[in-house]
């Protein structure tokens, strides 16, 4: 009789320690559910204020017709200015016309004088040719006047209203360029 | 956190091709941008190619017109396809999130091209 009792005993003491297994698991996932609606609410409320802001170009870019631009307040070498532009999700400037120069550099003038920013033109070693980070070639009005005499990479700069060249490890500030967001309405 | 696991490589004679894949999970609503580093022995880590969420592209010179970067968001993959390769094209490629907090690398994928 004493030995069918301990036996249920233990049975019980079995169910108890799986039961709150269990319950540590439930409390584990409820608490992983938790954090995901955290996420989630955090993500929409994001999604949310974005679209109820419905801004063309984040804060503290510039507009220009279908782009927004972004002037650095920091210096850094050409290879760490695009991976900055990376970062907020956006490329190294590429000019495509006149306009689009006349306005960068119309904007300059007002922000910040006159300073170099990197953009996104770089010549390859090889041929000499200059390119835009996506492959495409710039248009004739719109290559670097030859000024770098370096035997290091070069890279292309905004300087006033010029388009010229440096070897790409020196420091200089830089504009970023993503395209702005059409409005829905 | 943004998990990234890259496959794919392997060794090819110079003039073949190879597409590098990069399957990208967690956090992946805070990526804003994609890209593809590569580190040959001895030399620094360098940005080989990418592409934002908007779609801009950017190359390093040495593989414009031979390297191509795309992603299915579907699939959550980003995909590095390289042409023409040259014997200079060997290092290890890794897969790289931007996110207005930092860069995160995969383990990367060896990249071997013998002449």
């Known amino acids: 009789k004493l030995l069918q009792v301990s036996t249920i005993a233990m049975q019980q003491q079995e169910k108890l320690i799986q039961q709150e297994r269990a319950l540590l698991n439930f409390t584990e996932w409820k608490r992983s559910c938790a954090l995901q609606m955290k996420y989630c609410q955090a993500f929409m409320q994001n999604s949310l204020s974005s679209a109820h802001n419905s801004s063309p170009c984040p804060n503290n870019w510039i507009q220009n017709r279908e782009s927004c631009y972004y002037v650095s307040e920091i210096w850094s070498i050409w290879h760490t200015s695009q991976e900055n532009c990376l970062k907020e999700g956006s490329t190294l400037l590429q000019i495509e016309s006149k306009e689009e120069m006349d306005f960068i550099t119309g904007s300059l003038r007002k922000i910040k004088g006159s300073y170099d920013y990197w953009v996104g033109l770089s010549q390859d070693g090889h041929s000499g040719r200059w390119l835009w980070q996506d492959g495409s070639s710039p248009s004739p009005g719109l290559l670097p006047a030859e000024r770098s005499q370096s035997a290091n990479q070069v890279c292309g700069y905004v300087k006033s209203n010029s388009l010229l060249s440096s070897n790409c490890s020196t420091w200089k500030y830089f504009i970023c360029e993503k395209y702005a967001l059409r409005s829905s309405v | 956190q943004v998990q990234l696991q890259e496959s794919g490589g392997g060794l090819v004679q110079a003039g073949e091709s190879l597409r590098l894949s990069c399957v990208v999970s967690?956090?992946?609503?805070?990526?804003?941008?994609m890209g593809w580093y590569r580190q040959a022995p001895g030399k620094q880590r360098e940005l080989v190619a990418a592409?934002?969420?908007?779609?801009?592209?950017s190359y390093v010179d040495s593989v414009k017109g031979r390297f191509t970067i795309s992603r299915d968001n579907a699939a959550n993959t980003v995909y590095l396809q390289m042409n023409s390769l040259k014997p200079e094209d060997t290092a290890v490629y890794y897969c790289a999130a931007f996110q207005s907090s930092g860069i995160d690398w995969g383990q990367g994928t060896q990249v071997t091209v013998s002449s």
């Open positions: 967690g956090r992946t609503f805070s990526i804003n941008a």
């Open positions: 592409i934002t969420n908007q779609g801009r592209l």
